[in-house]
């Protein structure tokens, strides 16, 4: 489901997040900040003037400038969620859409190599749709998705870096390799 | 909702530098790539090179590594690329785009771009 | 990686279907994105990975393609799909794109 003006928010699995609300601004005119969950249509959070701010459950957190929290983030928070405010007149005065989506942390990549086939390896194991960047020193050699594997025809002795990233995170790790002339692993 | 806010023009002198600005907003900045492209008058499309804002990693084309630098600033939400010493072949539209880390090579949504004339 | 697109201008009737044609100079796999520029506009993105539609863009628009040779159709066109399309490599850096097709109206 696609909502054209949604803000589109991601956050990662096990995290917490913080939905702000963009332009807005706290004043004593407002009365009522209403935050709900659309697939279920409903309410999960507000703060009114004068009375106990609610929250559906412990995992949300509603701060007073509007911005709801979610706490370590799980696969059903995925969702769209939209905040309404309302001043003492009773007036929708901001209302916002945000769509949220959650992908997994990727792990560090693994490089791995052997003298003997002359190939190396980059691997990472845990995350959502992570992309891969292969580099010798410095210089990029090949993208791929979850794994790269570099096949080299001279003798090596090369920095490689292997990064793997999705929306949500990012990491590196970088070896030194040195193969000899012969090919001994 | 997702903008790349760019400003329209920008004339310069020969020689000298600009700084070209690139405003995100409606998504998750710190979850995509920012790439620059340059567009002369008429004529295709130039990758000039990119930066990711979750941590300022830059890639750059060859032939502009002396040329342009591209830098964050993560609390605006905005991208900027310094192009230095500036000839009349400067001269042209310049795109800042986003693209998405998990699959960064296709440039999903552009800003205006900015018009760059190089004149004395 | 060099990108050769053809042909250069494309002459078209509405309710035509049209190909245009993208070659890479290596294989690049699927790693392939076109764009669409109309006249004092933006790119903006059509296909991605050869063959991936794009939410938004109207499903006359497709792709196709692998390694080296690729193609981009329209298998109706309308008034307002004229402008100047790019194939762009997605495989290795720089991202390089083709000159361009420029599709007009007959």
């Known amino acids: 489901k696609e909502i054209t003006n949604a803000l589109e928010t991601w956050g990662a699995l096990g995290q917490d997040i913080n939905l702000d609300i963009p332009s807005f601004q706290m004043s004593d005119d407002i009365d009522d900040i209403k935050w709900e969950k659309t697939s279920d249509k409903k309410k999960i959070a507000q703060f009114r003037k004068e009375k106990e701010t609610f929250k559906e459950k412990d995992t949300y957190k509603l701060f007073k400038n509007g911005t709801l929290k979610i706490k370590h983030l799980k696969t059903d928070d995925q969702d769209i969620y939209k905040v309404s405010i309302y001043d003492t007149k009773g007036k929708n005065v901001l209302e916002k859409i945000f769509d949220l989506k959650i992908q997994e942390r990727v792990s560090k990549p693994k490089i791995s190599w052997t003298c003997i086939n002359t190939t190396l390896t980059c691997e990472v194991m845990n995350g959502t749709d992570p992309e891969l960047n292969l580099y010798q020193d410095g210089k990029h050699l090949k993208l791929s998705q979850r794994v790269i594997t570099h096949k080299w025809t001279t003798s090596l002795s090369a920095k490689f870096k292997c990064t793997a990233g999705n929306k949500v995170s990012k990491e590196s790790s970088v070896e030194p390799v040195s193969c000899p002339e012969k090919g001994l692993d | 909702q997702v903008q790349l806010q760019q400003p329209g023009t920008e004339l310069v002198r020969p020689g000298s530098s600009v700084k070209l600005s690139c405003k995100a907003s409606?998504?998750?900045?710190?979850?995509?790539?920012v790439n620059w492209v340059k567009q002369r008058p008429d004529q295709g499309l130039e990758w000039i090179g990119r930066?990711?804002?979750?941590?300022?990693?830059?890639h750059y084309n060859q032939k502009f590594t002396d040329k342009a630098i591209s830098t964050i600033d993560t609390s605006s939400n905005t991208a900027y690329m310094q192009l230095s010493t500036l000839t009349s072949d400067a001269s042209a539209v310049y795109y800042c785009?986003?693209?998405?880390?998990?699959?960064?090579?296709?440039?999903?949504?552009w800003g205006q771009g900015t018009l760059v004339t190089v004149s004395s | 990686i060099v990108m050769t697109q053809s042909p250069a201008t494309l002459s078209v009737t509405p309710g035509d279907r049209v190909s245009l044609s993208c070659r890479a100079s290596?294989?690049?796999?699927?790693?392939l994105h076109w764009y669409q520029q109309k006249s004092h506009e933006s790119p903006r993105l059509l296909i991605k990975?050869?063959?991936q539609s794009i939410s938004g863009i109207p499903s006359r628009f497709s792709g196709s393609g692998s390694g080296s040779d690729f193609t981009l159709s329209i298998n109706s066109v309308e008034p307002e799909d004229v402008g100047v399309y790019y194939c762009?490599?997605?495989?290795?850096?720089?991202?390089?794109f083709g000159a361009g097709t420029k599709l007009e109206l007959r």
């Open positions: 762009q490599n997605g495989h290795s850096f720089p991202l390089t």
């Open positions: 785009s986003r693209s998405p880390r998990d699959s960064s090579t296709n440039l999903a949504d």
């Open positions: 290596q294989s690049i796999s699927d790693y």
């Open positions: 930066i990711d804002p979750y941590d300022s990693e830059t």
């Open positions: 990975y050869a063959s």
């Open positions: 409606g998504y998750t900045f710190t979850s995509y790539w």
